[in-house]
């Protein structure tokens, strides 16, 4: 926890941010908790970024105040309102840009007294993985697809069968720029497979790390799929 | 030592352009955000322009606005202050200034000596 | 644009005396305050931020305090080198702004 120390008489209250991650050209949540107040009136939220003059966000006596609101994030945010009274000073962040990645402190006042905390934001891109069989190929093959990445992450097979395995030598993973040229369509082949067996497939860059199963057996195939963002810590 | 040295000024008509430097050094200069302040013959301190510490966002006062444009070179630790259509009252000593804390609530920590611009027939 | 007026405009006081300096905001700027000294041909040098933090090296007579729209600065006790001119500074907008100054003479 990061706790203010009070100034001009008044206590200092404790702040809480979480670490967190954005997906470029979706809406992104900066974490923000702290001892609420009363009286809504009272609370005062700013939010700002490190490297940026104006404010992020301001919120103040049961509303938005964005007269000092910097350009670059005009339009993009809100608090969740109905919640600042219940100590959420969360801030929603829309259509998150690469420029967006950086450190944020979210400076709260209260009839109680002022704290702040600051996070670490990163932006990137990242999705889920599909893996098909490719019954075009001329040996059994695995793909591994997934439609949104940045910046370039890794991709490494296993198998529950061959734990330990290296597949670098029996697979390979290109990278195609999708249209805004800046994300990458992530694509994976995994030759040479057998069956009666479980495949992972795992994408993982600085941000996030996600993984797609795939169990081939003779009469059935089953597939699987999770994503976990990474470096989420509270300050 | 964290210094800032400030060029460029002098005697110019009205009319006229002029480009103040400001030389930085014993600091990460990226990371700052940079001020120009002026202060005219016997009067008080006016803010004219700033800059992030990307160079990304500027910003001016409205008395300069469309006439001062302010730049900053990292590769060369220098800022900029570029002035077109100079007048008479523009006359003032230019002070660069560095802007404390990482958010850009705090104050200006480290001021240049100043550089004289003098705008006269 | 945020008008930054402080009070007195000028003042006469003794070695040894306690100063204070007002400064009003036109609207609440919480504790984006800063304080400069400036010394005849020399540049301001910063002596609070934030409305009552000290940086580095700056005497411990010096304090300030408020936060809102009313901020003072004190003197504890006036040295022969505190005669100068002092400036308030707003920085909660991106539209900077100084007091007009408060001159500290000599009685």
């Known amino acids: 926890l990061i706790i203010g120390f009070g100034i001009s008489g008044r206590h200092s209250i404790t702040v809480t941010t979480v670490a967190s991650a954005g997906n470029i050209g979706e809406d992104g949540i900066l974490s923000c908790t702290f001892e609420p107040d009363i009286k809504l009136s009272d609370i005062v939220i700013q939010w700002l970024k490190e490297g940026v003059l104006g404010l992020v966000h301001e919120f103040k006596e049961g509303k938005d105040e964005l007269s000092e609101q910097d350009e670059m994030f005009r339009g993009r945010t809100a608090v969740f309102a109905d919640q600042v009274i219940v100590g959420n000073a969360s801030l929603r962040l829309k259509n998150v840009q690469l420029t967006d990645a950086g450190t944020y402190k979210c400076y709260i006042i209260t009839s109680k007294g002022k704290g702040n905390a600051n996070l670490e934001y990163k932006t990137g891109a990242f999705s889920m993985p599909e893996v098909n069989v490719d019954y075009n190929a001329s040996s059994e093959t695995l793909r591994c697809e997934a439609p949104r990445w940045f910046p370039q992450p890794t991709v490494v097979w296993a198998s529950q069968v061959d734990q330990g395995a290296n597949f670098s030598e029996v697979s390979n993973t290109s990278f195609e720029l999708n249209s805004e040229n800046v994300t990458m369509k992530v694509v994976s082949v995994l030759y040479n497979v057998t069956i009666n067996n479980t495949y992972s497939c795992m994408i993982e860059n600085d941000i996030a790390k996600a993984t797609g199963d795939i169990k081939v057996t003779e009469s059935e195939i089953k597939r699987r799929s999770h994503l976990q963002l990474l470096n989420s810590k509270a300050s | 030592e964290v210094q800032l040295l400030e060029s460029g000024g002098g005697l110019v008509q009205p009319g006229g352009s002029l480009r103040l430097s400001c030389a930085a050094s014993g600091f990460t200069f990226n990371t700052h955000a940079m001020h120009w302040v002026r202060q005219a013959p016997g009067k008080g301190l006016e803010w004219v322009s700033a800059i992030s510490g990307s160079g990304g966002s500027t910003y001016y006062a409205d008395s300069v606005k469309g006439r001062f444009t302010i730049s900053r070179d990292i590769s060369k630790n220098t800022l900029y202050l570029q002035m077109n259509s100079l007048r008479a009252e523009d006359t003032a000593v230019y002070y660069c200034?560095?802007?404390?804390?990482?958010?850009?609530?705090?104050?200006?920590?480290?001021w240049g000596q100043g550089t004289t611009v003098t705008v006269s027939s | 644009d945020i008008q930054m007026t402080q009070s007195p405009s000028s003042l006469s006081a003794s070695v040894g005396d306690r100063v204070t300096i007002t400064c009003r905001a036109s609207q609440n700027i919480y504790t984006w305050l800063a304080w400069y000294q400036q010394k005849p041909g020399k540049a301001p040098k910063l002596l609070i931020y934030d409305a009552t933090n000290l940086p580095t090296g700056v005497p411990s007579r010096f304090s300030g305090s408020g936060s809102g729209t009313d901020f003072t600065l004190t003197i504890s006790s006036l040295q022969p080198e505190d005669f100068a001119t002092y400036y308030c500074?707003?920085?909660?907008?991106?539209?900077?702004?100084f007091g007009g100054g408060t001159k500290v003479e000599i009685k």
């Open positions: 200034a560095r802007l404390l804390g990482r958010f850009g609530e705090y104050g200006m920590d480290v």
């Open positions: 500074q707003q920085s909660y907008s991106t539209r900077w702004t």
